[in-house]
Amino acid sequence: QKSSIEKCSVDIQQSRNKTTERPGLLNCPIYWQQLREKCLLFSHTVNPWNNSLADCSTKESSLLLIRDKDELIHTQNLIRDKAILFWIGLNFSLSEKNWKWINGSFLNSNDLEIRGDAKENSCISISQTSVYSEYCSTEIRWICQKELTPVRNKVYPDS
């Protein structure tokens, strides 16, 4: 046998514990990547869509919301691995028979060109080049987002 058995020294404050942050974010936290007015965090493990949604919430964040084609392209440019898929915050609402973002809004049909079926238990993933409908139970990586708070100039009354 190669090695003797040792115990590991690990962080007391584990990263998956919920963090408390002040409301409003001026800069992206460490480990997050800034993309315009957002901070993005790419997972290093795999999960079904529901677990991914829950895990983002432990980081005081949500699954990625994409406003338009331009934001999609900029996000895809951050993806370095060709074949990797990432969950985003969009799934199929059976009751409304439409793609629904986790913030409650519906997908504008022009925003994303989705490959695959719009049906029950379908969720949306993105890769470096495409947008796919996948079974929500599929285990892939995911992207969390935090919104940056724009800094507004303070207006002082005349003295």
Partner: antibody, heavy 120, light 107 residues
Framework: QVQLVQSGAEVKKPGASVKVSCKAS????????MNWVRQAPGQGLEWMGL????????YYNQKFKDRVTMTRDTSISTAYMELSRLRSDDTAVYYC?????????????WGQGTTVTVSS | DIQLTQSPSFLSASVGDRVTITCKAS??????VVWYQQTPGKAPKLLID???IRHTGVPDRFSGSGSGTEFTLTISSLQPEDFADYFC?????????FGGGTKLEIK
Amino acid sequence: QVQLVQSGAEVKKPGASVKVSCKASGYSFTGYTMNWVRQAPGQGLEWMGLINPNTGGTYYNQKFKDRVTMTRDTSISTAYMELSRLRSDDTAVYYCARLGDNYRGYFDCWGQGTTVTVSS
Amino acid sequence: DIQLTQSPSFLSASVGDRVTITCKASQDVGTAVVWYQQTPGKAPKLLIDWASIRHTGVPDRFSGSGSGTEFTLTISSLQPEDFADYFCQQYSTYLYTFGGGTKLEIK
């Protein structure tokens, strides 16, 4: 205390399969992704793949995709790595290694290693 | 795949010396670099994450720096227990890769 304890050394013939186990203790087994890394004699480390013990989801290094299977048994907090169609160049020490964070690719705890020798 | 080249491969030094090990990446990896120590007969042990963040319990004589393609691990004053192998690793892509290692020996 966090600890990963692996199964004992194995000697296998070319073409056979080997299954290495990794028993976790001192933390929530389903809360951390398990990876497998190997080290051939006199060589560097090579990442083989990962398993999410909570769901059983896996992702493999393309190099091993057709030969490796990673599984887990949550009832005994144990992860397994099976490598099939063994070749002489699979002779290595195989480590399980815990991913320290879901969003970063570092390994904060390693098993003691399992030596697998492939020889005819 | 991203290749990591460590230098030197072998390094002889004495207790109390300051030593620096370099890790060069074939592509920009940002700061997604980790350093491990492996003493003979033991499993690798995490020293530094994110290029410069020391792991819990790691003595402050170990420090990491760099970003992009060039990274260094510095041991400010070598102790007897520091003579070991050192590996860098990148996780900028999901195919994690490791450097070839640096063997630090007693002079």
